[in-house]
Amino acid sequence: SERCDDWGLDTMRQIQVFEDEPARIKCPLFEHFLKFNYSTAHSAGLTLIWYWTRQDRDLEEPINFRLPENRISKEKDVLWFRPTLLNDTGNYTCMLRNTTYCSKVAFPLEVVQKDSCFNSPMKLPVHKLYIEYGIQRITCPNVDGYFPSSVKPTITWYMGCYKIQNFNNVIPEGMNLSFLIALISNNGNYTCVVTYPENGRTFHLTRTLTVKVVGSPKNAVPPVIHSPNDHVVYEKEPGEELLIPCTVYFSFLMDSRNEVWWTIDGKKPDDITIDVTINESISHSRTEDETRTQILSIKKVTSEDLKRSYVCHARSAKGEVAKAAKVKQKVPAPRYTVELACGFGAT
């Protein structure tokens, strides 16, 4: 067979679908690999061919489009399952070709089982709601294209295992679930079950997402450096270990990059010759505010090191701050037997 541009197995698009539910899977070629869409390809005389490799097999086989009730069908660039079965799991390939052109990509499809409380190995999208922010909503995801707009589905929302009904601050509104007040207690998994008729059959779509209540942007502040501060002086003798923690609090900010770094005499530690190590730890509050600690360590400090300027810097989308640590050389205590004796005029 003639050469085909093979994009390989696209593991970035690990598709997971629930058993016994409809699934519509678009050929990834047009979405991520080619610069033209299916309509253009089709009108140029290109044909889209589907085949698959079953789980734990090496043999590529054509997809059987002659199953009862058209359980698997193709429509334009979409492969349809009405519904899926557990043994549909495997690697699926879509190939676009004519006599002079060929391009193909494979992707894994996993059909997963869920229990009666919607628990499953499915990777869940996370939707972040701001705490005590006002009315916010989530929308039942990935249900477009399953039924025409003339079909009015029924939608039932669940939190965990429980149907959302008279939930006080959480109000189901069809495809949307509105939170009148988002509280930490609203953290959890929310599931919408969309039920719709098609050709005398009833299908269900189950979509679960994780809601995480995070700090509100209205309460966000620039980074706060808790340490170093003016109350602590790092007083060391040459030869001792110098440890200075830089502890910074960051308000949660959607898509903000939080950074902490040290400078020594205005330079990054990597750019100077002294033997410095920096260890970082990160912790989060329940609303995803972040505390970063970077501990600057010099194993055996010299008197030169104790004269340097050690500054902790922090930056987020809200601003940049810096704080110098107070470092000084310890003045040696007087040696009592000699100095004090001399002071008293002893001979």
């Epitope: 701001y130 005590e132 922010y133 006002g134 009315i135 909503r137 929308t139 008279n166 006080n168 601050n169 109000i171 189901p172 509104e173 069809g174 949307n176 509105s178 009148l180 007040i181 509100s216 209205k218 309460n219």
Partner: antibody, heavy 120, light 110 residues
């Protein structure tokens, strides 16, 4: 005693501005509540004007006809409605109301209202 | 914007009668519906919220039902103190958050 008390209603000329206040007592504005203004023209029905979230974000919601001319705001225990470019059709009793966001959004507490008359 | 249409606009009834007032929303409001009672010179008083939940201190002769776009307030046995104007109020939280009131139903003595 939990109550709302409106004030600031007056007789004003068309085109004038007016600020209404609603003092809360017996409860504090908190993240549980939304505070709203509703008006009622003489002999007519109730009409929603605007709401504000009582939490720190202070998110605001307006009836389409009120956007631009009316502004809702709050401090720790008082709700305000700033009304600009007043017209004769703004003549009404203005009520403030509390919405309990932790109880399915029920409008569970209302003030007695303050009368605004716009006339030349 | 949502519109709430109440019917009838007025009704005359006697003490002990069963009274039904209906309210239709211009779009699905998913049971985000409340009913209020207002007497002349007074503020509205909440009777029912979330379509069917009875507000605190409201007599059990008041009940609410409905879903989607159509809702009903029922007074099972009208009492003398029930002669007043009744308003429905709908809310939509998804999309543009808004609230709207019906035009009112005046219940008068027959």
């Amino acid at each position: 005693q939990v109550q709302l008390q409106e004030s600031g209603g007056d007789l004003v000329q068309p085109g004038a501005s007016l600020r209404l206040s609603c003092a809360a007592s017996g409860f504090s504005f908190s993240s549980t509540y939304y505070m709203c203004w509703v008006r009622q023209a003489p002999g007519k029905g109730l009409e929603w004007v605007a709401c504000i979230y009582a939490g720190s974000s202070g998110s605001t919601y307006y009836a389409s006809w009120a956007k631009g001319r009316f502004t809702i705001s709050k401090n720790s225990s008082t709700l305000y409605l700033q009304m600009n470019s007043l017209r004769a059709e703004d003549t009404a009793v203005y009520f403030c109301a509390r919405v309990d966001g932790s109880s399915s959004g029920s409008w569970d507490l209302w003030g007695q209202g303050t009368l605004v008359t716009v006339s030349s | 914007a949502i519109q709430m249409t109440q019917s009838p606009s007025s009704l005359s009834a006697s003490v002990g009668d069963r009274v039904t007032i209906t309210c239709q929303a211009s779009q699905n409001i998913y049971s985000n519906l409340a009913w209020y009672q207002q007497k002349p010179g007074q503020a509205p008083k909440l009777l029912i919220y979330a379509a069917s939940l009875l507000a605190s201190g409201v007599p059990s002769r008041f009940s609410g039902s409905g879903s989607g776009t159509d809702y009903t307030l029922t007074i099972s046995s009208l009492q003398p103190e029930d002669f007043a104007t009744y308003y429905c109020q709908g809310a939509v939280y998804s999309g543009n958050t808004e609230w709207a009131f019906g035009q009112g139903t005046k219940v008068v003595i027959k």
